[in-house]
Every structure is written in structure tokens, then in C-alpha cells.
Interface confidence: low
């Protein structure tokens, strides 16, 4: 809202002013009257009934300071110019408005000539008599502005060319875009420009503890004509560890913060830190309590998680599933993921190292966020160390580290992979495979085969191979085969038992 | 013709209450400010009240003020006052008369009070 | 006490003529507000005589006349006869009260 700057106020006087009138003693009076039981003072004329008015009230000379465009308030009064005797031919309803800019006060000396013609004014609502019955005369109010004045004083005049006119109200005054503070920027009070169509630029200065944020504009608004603040640039923001309040930025209380120049208020200190200054930018971790790099000041202080809570490694032939549960303190992130890592010891002479390179892992051993793994191509009859190991993202912080360990022997090769290569009525060929690495810890292959439905006898016949031909059979005879390994350390885990068919006397031509 | 006539007076206790009625006829009464004018026995007329015509503008004597009230109803054509905590210095007689408000302007004629009832008389005695 | 001041009584032998003073102040006849003149026959209600100073309704004789001049007002009556015998009240206004309208005291006029 613009703030007005008054010069001059009539209204406000009590009669006081003293204004000149012309001619003297005749047209323009000042009087008296009664408005919602408070006496009033208005200058009034009414001359209506004779022709060729001239009636001039002039007032006291205005000195004008720092504006540059005044604005002139009026409030007054028109009679009806039918509720005079024959409607008064010579009656106005109008009356004119004049300035004069001078450097010093002419006193009684009036030169009309002096004077420019700022408008005339007419009223939106004229008075007539039932309005005068009711004690309600209409007022009027019109405002006029002129600009830019350069002179160090001015006067207004009043010129009645024949109504009956009442002013009760002139106000002169001059428009400041008032002293504001917005976006926490503080803007000076300024004298509104002469030129409606300008716009002052005024720069802003940031309120004690705010700043222009990070590639922000300065702040800036524009003074108006009218004395309103138009087209706000910029702004600024409370400072890391200021907040708003108002419009200042006031310090973070004790246990609050504020990192960073932003609107945001300060917020509480985070569990497990300790409590803060006045003004924190951050809230310091207790002892124990971690922030990773990543982390925002807002988020809880954390620490690396206790070990896996349980751990099972279950030997299944050469190949081992690991199984654990998260750990019961995460240390309060979720970020948690498991490394599992491998070690191998020959019974023999205990010598033991890594065996990353020798084992296959269901998927990567590293950053896993399931809580199971599946080793596999493990060699037999050695001893193998499995350690889980939990990390979380403020692990890195400490030298200590979270895990569980489990062992398993594998004391059997894996069961081999057992193939019906081909068939006859009286033969069945069969092949077999052991992953690679076992190969080498394996003697002889011993095949076991019977009948089915015979459990009182069987067939074993051993081979260094990883193929067989089964002959002597009886046609069109389901029998059972089984494979097993066999090693320096004894027999190896034994393959699945299959059932394999030969071929009847009539398929037999195929 | 313009007449104005009163009625409600009466005997009424110190502390009681009385409302007067002033019936218009013969003019637009919507159009006329309207008093309140008494007369207390062997002595000179009181203003009492005033009422714009729209009722927007009222006033009191001093010596009624917070006591009575004055209101009309320009569809009935009706002036009342209702007056309460009566006291024996309110006896007299209440007249009613149509009002044009004096002027500031010169020129302008002030017909002041130009129509009056034939008055009701309200006595207040214990 | 009223706030304009009359004289309490006057009188006049039938056809001389008589006036009644009506004297206030700065702050009601002195300030410019109207003077208006009532005639109180006895056992009546008042009747509007002079209005805004000077000017007779219709249908008063023109032997009334009313005159205003600074602080003062005042009612001459020409050629008396018995029936003006009556109190007589002037009214105007007064920016310093409440409501604003004042009456005289009010003058008793015998016609001997």
C-alpha cells in the first residue's frame, strides 16, 4: 500500500487556513456545520441566480519538499440546479481546478494569470431537495494528480463560474513506496516517480543473517507512480543455522539446525546426536555414531551393523548353501549388504588359503542384499571356512568389521551326472560327468545295476572311464543304475538311481 | 390535507414505559425528516428527536438520550417513540412535526418545522 | 435555561406594533443557521409563522415579519389584533449540542 505524504489537509485544519478569496468579500465563504455531530468547516458558494460568476478561492501557499507529483483530494458538494427558482438559468454544476508553482509565498497578491487549469470537476452525484430534507447531501469525491513540479512551493485554486458548492475535504498529498521488508530483503522508503509509465528500480539489502541464495538474483522492486511496490526480483534466505521468523532470520534454537541457506525452518538435532548451539548448522554424532558422506543432516546418526545373526552352511555333495539373518542391530541404516568370503584347508597337511578362484557363487559374494548363497565346485575331502561379513554405509568409518563364520568338510565327490547314451534289447549304454575339479581325486567309476523289482541281487562293474555298456541284459527289462565315484579316501557321493528300459525282442529292428 | 396525529399518552408509573405514535396523512412522509417536540405543563417547547427521512441519520436531546428511542415506518405512514424509564421531569405534552433541515447555502430556504400534530400528553406520577 | 433567550412577556394595545427580541450566540445564530418563529395560540399546538429567517408560509398575514442580524433574531408584528395575543417560541440550531436544534424560552404576548 502506498503511503501518503500530506501537504496540505483542509479538513484537518478546523477552519484555521485562512484561504484568500476573490473577489474579496463576495462568492467563496468559509462556514460551519454539523456532520454526524462534529462540526465541520467548508468553504461554499452559491451565486446562482445571477449571471457571469468569477469567484476565486485560492490556497495558502504549499511548500512541496520531495515530491514530485502531487495528488489533490477533493470532497465536496453540488446542488441540484433544479431546486432553485426557475431552475436558475445561469446556475453551474461544475467548477474548476487551478495550480500555481512559485518559489516563494505570493501573500494576498493574486494573479489569476498565474494559474494553470488542472481539470474541471463535476460531480458524480448532485443534491437535491428531498436529500436536503433528510439531511443527506451527496458527496463527492475526485481526485487529480500533476507532475512533475519543480518549483519549491505551489498553490490551488478554486474557480466557481455560478453553482452552489460545498468543499468540505482538500487534501493534497504526495505517494512514498513505504519502507518494506520482503524476501527478507529490506527495501528503502522511496518517493514515488512523476511518470506514470516509469517504474524506479530499488535494490534490496538482505535482512542481518539472510543471503542471496547460491546463483540467485539480488533482490529488487519497483516503485510505482502510485507509491505500491510492483515486480519483486530476487529474494533472500536465512543463512545455514538462521530460520524465518517474520521477517528476520532468527538463530536455530539449542538442539535444532539448519545447514544449509534455504526456506526451510530449522529442525530438531537427529537421534543419536548430541545437542546443539544456538545457530548449529549441524548436529554433531555421539560417540559411536557415524554419518556417511552421502548422508543429509536431517537423517539419524548411524553405526555399522552387529554380525549376521545366524549362520548355516548345509554340505549338499561338492556344492554348499549358506544361509543367514540379517543382523538384530542394523545400526539404524538400510543400506545393509553382506560380502561372503571363502577359505580351503587340506586335512592332510592344514595348510589352508583363499579359494575365491575355485568356487562358484550363485551370484556375486560381494554387496549382496539377499540373505543366501549357493557355493558350488568344491573339492572333496577338503575343509572349507565360509565367513558372512555385514556392512552397512557407515562401515567404512571403522576399522572393525561385523561377521560370522561357518565350516563345512566336504568329505564325498559330487554325485555324478548320470546319461542313457543308448539301448538294445539285451544292452544299455550309459555316461556320466563330475565337475572338473574333482575329477583329478577320482579313482575308478563303480556302476551298480539290478533289476527292477530284484532287490536280492545286483551287478557292479567298475571303469576309469566316464562310459559303460551294460551287456548280457534280458529284453524289454526296466533296471536300475546307479554311479559312484570312487577315491584314494573312499567312496564318493552316488548318483541318482535311474531307471532305464531295454528294448522288446519286436522294437528291436530300430 | 397534511395532518399529523399523535396517540399513546397516558398515566404511566416513574420507571415505566410508553410508546407515542404519529400518524402522517396528506404528504409523501418518506420524503420528510420528522421530531419530536414536547411541552411540559406552563412551560416553553423541547426538541426532544430527530429521524431522517430513511432513518439513517438520528439524534437525541441530552436529556433523553439512552432512555428513549425514535423510529419510523415509512410504509405505514407511522412516527414512534418509544420512551423508557420514565421519570416525572418527562411529563408534558408530545408533539410530532415534519421537519426540513436548515441549509448551509445561501439562497437555499429553511422551512423548518412546518407541520405539527395536536399533540398526546404522557404524565408521569406515581 | 434555553439556549436562545426571549423576553418572557410583551404586550400592545390592538393595531400598534410590537417586537419580540431572540438573542443567542457564535454558536447558533451567530454561525450563520436559519431563525424560524412559531405562534403557540392557547390550547393549541405550535404553528410554523416565520421560516428561515424572513420568509412567511402562506396564509400568515404579512403584518409578521422576521429580521436576523449577528447574534440576534427578532419577530414584528404590525397592526396587533386580539387573536395574535399568544406565545410565541423562536427556533435555529446550535453546532454545539447534541441534535442541534434549540428553541427560545418562549415570550407571552398580551394584546391589552
Known amino acids: 500500500q502506498g503511503k501518503e505524504v500530506v501537504l496540505l489537509d483542509f479538513a484537518a485544519a478546523g477552519g484555521e487556513l485562512g484561504w484568500l478569496t476573490h473577489p474579496y468579500g463576495k462568492g467563496w465563504d468559509l462556514m460551519q456545520n454539523i456532520m454526524n455531530d462534529m462540526p465541520i468547516y467548508m468553504y461554499s458558494v452559491c451565486n446562482v441566480m445571477s449571471g457571469d460568476q468569477d469567484n476565486w478561492l485560492r490556497t495558502n501557499w504549499v511548500y512541496r519538499g520531495e515530491a514530485e507529483r502531487i495528488f489533490i483530494e477533493l470532497k465536496f458538494t453540488v446542488r441540484d440546479c433544479n431546486s432553485f427558482p426557475g431552475g436558475a438559468s445561469s446556475c453551474k454544476e461544475t467548477f474548476n481546478l487551478y495550480y500555481a508553482e512559485s518559489d516563494l509565498d505570493y501573500g494576498t497578491n493574486f494573479q489569476k494569470r498565474l494559474f494553470t487549469k488542472i481539470d474541471t470537476i463535476a460531480p458524480d452525484e448532485i443534491t437535491v431537495s428531498s436529500d436536503f430534507e433528510a439531511r443527506h447531501v451527496k458527496l463527492n469525491v475526485e481526485e487529480r494528480s500533476v507532475g512533475p513540479l519543480t518549483r519549491k512551493g505551489f498553490y490551488l485554486a478554486f474557480q466557481d463560474i455560478g453553482a452552489c458548492v460545498a468543499l468540505l475535504s482538500v487534501r493534497v498529498y504526495y505517494k512514498k513506496c513505504p519502507e518494506l521488508l520482503q524476501g527478507l530483503a529490506h527495501f528503502p522508503e522511496t518517493i514515488a516517480g512523476s511518470d506514470a509509465p516509469s517504474l524506479a528500480t530499488v535494490a534490496g539489502t538482505c535482512v542481518d543473517h539472510a543471503v542471496v541464495p547460491p546463483g540467485g538474483e539480488e533482490p529488487r522492486m519497483h516503485c510505482a507512480v502510485d507509491g505500491e511496490w510492483l515486480v519483486p526480483i530476487g529474494q533472500c534466505l536465512c543463512q545455514a543455522g538462521y530460520e524465518k521468523v517474520e521477517d528476520a532470520c532468527q538463530a536455530c534454537s539449542p538442539g535444532f539446525f539448519k545447514f544449509e541457506a534455504s526456506e526451510s525452518p530449522c529442525l530438531e538435532c537427529p537421534e543419536h546426536t548430541l545437542p546443539s548451539p544456538e545457530g548449529a548448522t549441524s548436529c554433531e554424532c555421539e560417540e559411536g555414531f557415524f554419518r556417511a558422506p552421502q548422508d543429509p543432516a536431517s537423517m539419524p546418526c548411524t553405526r555399522p551393523p552387529s554380525a549376521p545373526h545366524y549362520l548355516t552352511a548345509v554340505g549338499m555333495g561338492a556344492k554348499v548353501e549358506l544361509r543367514w539373518t540379517p543382523p538384530q542391530d542394523s545400526g539404524g541404516r538400510e543400506d545393509i549388504v553382506y560380502s561372503v568370503t571363502c577359505e580351503q584347508c587340506w586335512p592332510e597337511s592344514g595348510e589352508c588359503g583363499p579359494c575365491e578362484a575355485s568356487v562358484r557363487y550363485s551370484e556375486p559374494p560381494h554387496g549382496l542384499t539377499r540373505t543366501s548363497v549357493t557355493v558350488s565346485d568344491l573339492e572333496p575331502h577338503m575343509n572349507y571356512t565360509f565367513t558372512v561379513e555385514a556392512r552397512n554405509g557407515v562401515s567404512g568409518l571403522v576399522t572393525s568389521r561385523s561377521f560370522r563364520t561357518a565350516s563345512v568338510s566336504i568329505n564325498q565327490t559330487e554325485p555324478p551326472k548320470v546319461r542313457l547314451e543308448g539301448r538294445s534289447t539285451t544292452s544299455l549304454s550309459v555316461s556320466w560327468s563330475i565337475p572338473p575339479p574333482q575329477q583329478s581325486r577320482v579313482w575308478k567309476y563303480e556302476v551298480t545295476y539290478r533289476k527292477k523289482g530284484d532287490s536280492n541281487s545286483y551287478n557292479v562293474r567298475r571303469t576309469e572311464g566316464f562310459s559303460v555298456t551294460l551287456d548280457d541284459l534280458a529284453p524289454d527289462t526296466t533296471y536300475l543304475v546307479q554311479v559312484q565315484a570312487l577315491t584314494q579316501e573312499g567312496q564318493g557321493a552316488g548318483s541318482k538311481v535311474h531307471e532305464f528300459q531295454t528294448l522288446s525282442p519286436e522294437g528291436s529292428g530300430n | 390535507e397534511v395532518q399529523l396525529v399523535e396517540s399513546g399518552g397516558g398515566l404511566v408509573q416513574p420507571g415505566g414505559s410508553l410508546r407515542l405514535s404519529c400518524a402522517a396523512s396528506?404528504?409523501?412522509?418518506?420524503?420528510?425528516?420528522m421530531n419530536w417536540v414536547r411541552q411540559a405543563p406552563g412551560k416553553g417547547l423541547e426538541w426532544v428527536s430527530y429521524?431522517?427521512?430513511?432513518?439513517?441519520?438520528?439524534y437525541y436531546a441530552d436529556s433523553v438520550k439512552g432512555r428513549f428511542t425514535i423510529s419510523r415506518d415509512n410504509a405505514k405512514n407511522s412516527l414512534y417513540l418509544q420512551m423508557n424509564s420514565l421519570r416525572a421531569e418527562d411529563t408534558a405534552v408530545y408533539y410530532c412535526?415534519?421537519?426540513?433541515?436548515?441549509?448551509?447555502?445561501?439562497?437555499?430556504?429553511?422551512?423548518?418545522?412546518?407541520?405539527w400534530g395536536q399533540g398526546t400528553t404522557v404524565t408521569v406520577s406515581s | 435555561q434555553s439556549v436562545l433567550t426571549q423576553p418572557p412577556s410583551v404586550s400592545g394595545a390592538p393595531g400598534q406594533r410590537v417586537t419580540i427580541s431572540c438573542t443567542g450566540s457564535?454558536?447558533?445564530?451567530?454561525?450563520?443557521?436559519?431563525v424560524h418563529w412559531y405562534q403557540q395560540l392557547p390550547g393549541t399546538a405550535p404553528k410554523l409563522l416565520i421560516y428561515?429567517?424572513?420568509n412567511r408560509p402562506s396564509g400568515v398575514p404579512d403584518r409578521f415579519s422576521g429580521s436576523k442580524s449577528g447574534t440576534s433574531a427578532s419577530l414584528a408584528i404590525t397592526g396587533l389584533q386580539a387573536e395574535d395575543e399568544a406565545d410565541y417560541y423562536c427556533?435555529?440550531?446550535?453546532?454545539?449540542?447534541?441534535?442541534?436544534?434549540?428553541f427560545g424560552g418562549g415570550t407571552k404576548l398580551t394584546v391589552l
Open positions: 412535526a415534519r421537519y426540513r433541515f436548515p441549509d448551509f447555502w445561501s439562497g437555499y430556504p429553511n422551512y423548518g418545522m412546518d407541520v
Open positions: 396528506g404528504f409523501t412522509f418518506s420524503s420528510y425528516s
Open positions: 429521524i431522517s427521512s430513511s432513518s439513517s441519520t438520528i
Open positions: 457564535s454558536s447558533n445564530i451567530g454561525a450563520g443557521y436559519d
Open positions: 428561515g429567517n424572513s
Open positions: 427556533q435555529s440550531y446550535d453546532s454545539s449540542l447534541s441534535g442541534h436544534v434549540v
